[in-house]
């Protein structure tokens, strides 16, 4: 059918609560495109009727709520004027009883469900709520070990729980709860978060400095091999992660099938005041779909990108 297949990472979700996934693949979805969702390679698209428990809402697929039997591979097909991309998303649904300690922990926790607070600093946790505009999210409540969090050190601000003067006792199991309203019906969203404490300066300490790249484009011929370094300076005691991402996904996950684009092994040089880190991204073969796409180097809260660009035609050759 001429569609290029892209495989996204697995999403592990909790049953009996709302879930939504947005089909975005910049720069493809930034232009005039149509997006259609399917389940398990079915030829019949997911319903667009808003009363349906599972339906498409603009570019999103929305489950109100998610149920045990909804596990499977979902495809969203993005059709542009001259292109077609099929994105595969593997959704795994599990039963999780946040306050039942007899039931094991979460399988394969993603970063959204594992968060860090920095000892002795003012820091915050985030309640990740990704839903389309049609979903109105109500007040958020925070719990620790199943008790609602109260006290001077804690402030619920938007989707965050601000924690002042973090102490070792702040580690543990948290949950954030929000009420979601859609078409007059109310649903409860409950996200569990495992919080660990670090003594080292990270977020809230110094900000890593990305020396290269500098948010620029690189001219590169189609089909060539390309290696780009991300050079970062940071404090010696930092806990920041450095990585390359595309479409907000680690490149190694994004290109998991083809392994055409890979992140290299990080190296560092130690100076008296700081460390200089280098982590590269390798394009084994530059393809057409790589052009115009921001490849982001992340270092803690700092980001910088490169965009591949076709070289301008050399008219001297004609």
């Amino acid at each position: 059918d001429g569609c290029k297949d892209i495989f996204m990472k697995n999403e592990i979700l909790s049953a009996s609560q709302p879930f939504a996934f947005n089909c975005t693949f910049p720069p493809i979805t930034s232009g005039e495109v149509s997006v259609t969702w399917y389940k398990n390679s079915s030829k019949i698209p997911v319903s667009k009727i808003i009363q349906s428990r599972i339906h498409q809402d603009e570019t999103w697929i929305l489950f109100l709520p998610m149920e045990w039997g909804d596990s499977g591979v979902y495809q969203c097909v993005i059709k542009g004027r001259d292109s077609c991309h099929r994105i595969h998303v593997n959704l795994t649904v599990f039963e999780k009883h946040w306050c039942d300690t007899s039931i094991g922990g979460l399988p394969n926790l993603s970063d959204e469900y594992k968060q860090i607070l920095h000892l002795g600093k003012d820091d915050s946790l985030t309640c990740h709520l990704h839903f389309p505009k049609s979903c109105v999210l109500g007040p958020i409540k925070w719990y620790k070990d199943c008790n609602e969090i109260k006290g001077e050190r804690f402030t619920v601000l938007e989707t965050r729980l601000l924690v002042s003067n973090v102490s070792a006792e702040d580690r543990g199991n948290y949950a954030c709860q929000a009420i979601l309203t859609h078409s007059g019906k109310q649903y409860e969203v409950l996200n569990g978060i495992t919080v660990s404490i670090t003594e080292r300066a990270g977020y809230g300490g110094s900000v890593p400095k990305i020396i290269y790249p500098k948010n620029h484009s690189i001219e590169v011929q189609l089909g060539t091999t390309l290696i780009v370094d991300c050079n970062v300076t940071d404090t010696k005691d930092n806990t920041n992660l450095r990585c390359w991402r595309v479409n907000n996904t680690l490149v190694d996950d994004y290109y998991d099938e083809s392994k055409r684009i890979r992140e290299g092994v990080e190296t560092h040089v130690s100076f008296r005041e700081h460390n200089l880190y280098t982590v590269n991204i390798t394009f084994l073969e530059v393809k057409m779909e790589d052009y115009g796409l921001p490849f982001m180097c992340h270092a803690g809260v700092s980001t910088a990108y490169i965009i591949l660009q076709l070289p301008a035609p050399d008219f001297r050759a004609y």
Epitope: Q115, D122, S124, T126, H128, L129, V136, L137, G138, P139, I140, K150, T155, L157, E158, T159, R160, L162, S164, A178, Y203, V207, N248, V301, S302, T303
Partner: antibody, heavy 120, light 112 residues
Framework: QVQLVQSGAEVKKPGASVKVSCKAS????????MNWVRQAPRQGLEWMGM????????RLNQKFKDRVTMTRDTSTSTVYMELSSLRSEDTAVYYC?????????????WGQGTLVTVSS | DIVMTQTPLSLSVTPGQPASISCRSS???????????FYWYLHKPGQPPQLLIY???NLASGVPDRFSGSGSGTDFTLKISRVEAEDVGVYYC?????????FGGGTKVEIK
């Protein structure tokens, strides 16, 4: 639609207190922080603090922690901000403000402002 | 406290011409959750302030699309593609990454 209506202008003597009210309508009063921001003549905007009607939770700018009290009357959906030990530099327009939504910050809704003049 | 520093202090613009205001924060406002807790407001004489941009680059409801916000974790820019007479006032940047919430000193925009 969301509306915040504040009490009228006040003239006070140094050392006195002033209590400014902010009556909310068009939304669930107990779901949102009410923020207070002031602007003194020829000065910028200054955040004084915020008050949550559920549980009477107050978070103050340290600059005002000894002089500001925030309270509410749930029956009339009104929040009050009292500033004590007034001095001439407290002459300002005082605004109450509410965020865009419960999950998106930024003050999308503002009261019309209350001018407080401190003069002997 | 996070300090917000705005430049320039004032700006005189010809109608129809572009304008740009800068703001720098003393700490990165880009959170681990990928949200940048940065805002732009316009305060017109005799009115309460008006939210223009939220979370660095999102246009607030009812704000004309001639306004746009961009930036990094610490350096931010508000651009007006074509200034109109109604755009006069004092522009403020603000952060709500952490308490206390803080504002920049303001940039006064007037029409030539």
């Amino acid at each position: 639609q969301v509306q915040l209506v504040q009490s009228g202008a006040e003239v006070k003597k140094p050392g006195a207190s002033v209590k400014v009210s902010c009556k909310a309508s068009g939304y669930t009063f107990t779901n949102y922080w009410m923020n207070w921001v002031r602007q003194a003549p020829r000065q910028g905007l200054e955040w004084m603090g915020m008050f949550h009607p559920t549980g009477d939770v107050t978070r103050l700018n340290q600059k005002f922690k000894d002089r500001v009290t925030m309270t509410r009357d749930t029956s009339t959906s009104t929040v009050y901000m009292e500033l004590s030990s007034l001095r001439s530099e407290d002459t300002a327009v005082y605004y109450c403000a509410r965020t865009t939504s419960m999950i998106i910050g930024g003050f999308a809704y503002w009261g019309q402002g209350t001018l407080v003049t401190v003069s002997s | 406290d996070i300090v917000m520093t705005q430049t320039p202090l004032s700006l005189s613009v010809t109608p129809g011409q572009p304008a740009s205001i800068s703001c720098r924060s003393s700490k990165s406002l880009l959170h681990r959750n990928a949200i940048t807790y940065f805002y732009w407001y316009l305060h017109k004489p005799g009115q309460p302030p008006q939210l223009l941009i939220y979370q660095m680059s999102n246009l607030a409801s009812g704000v004309p699309d001639r306004f746009s916000g961009s930036g990094s974790g610490t350096d931010f820019t508000l651009k007006i593609s074509r200034v109109e007479a109604e755009d006069v006032g004092v522009y403020y940047c603000a952060q709500n990454l952490e308490l206390p919430l803080t504002f920049g000193g303001g940039t006064k925009v007037e029409i030539k």
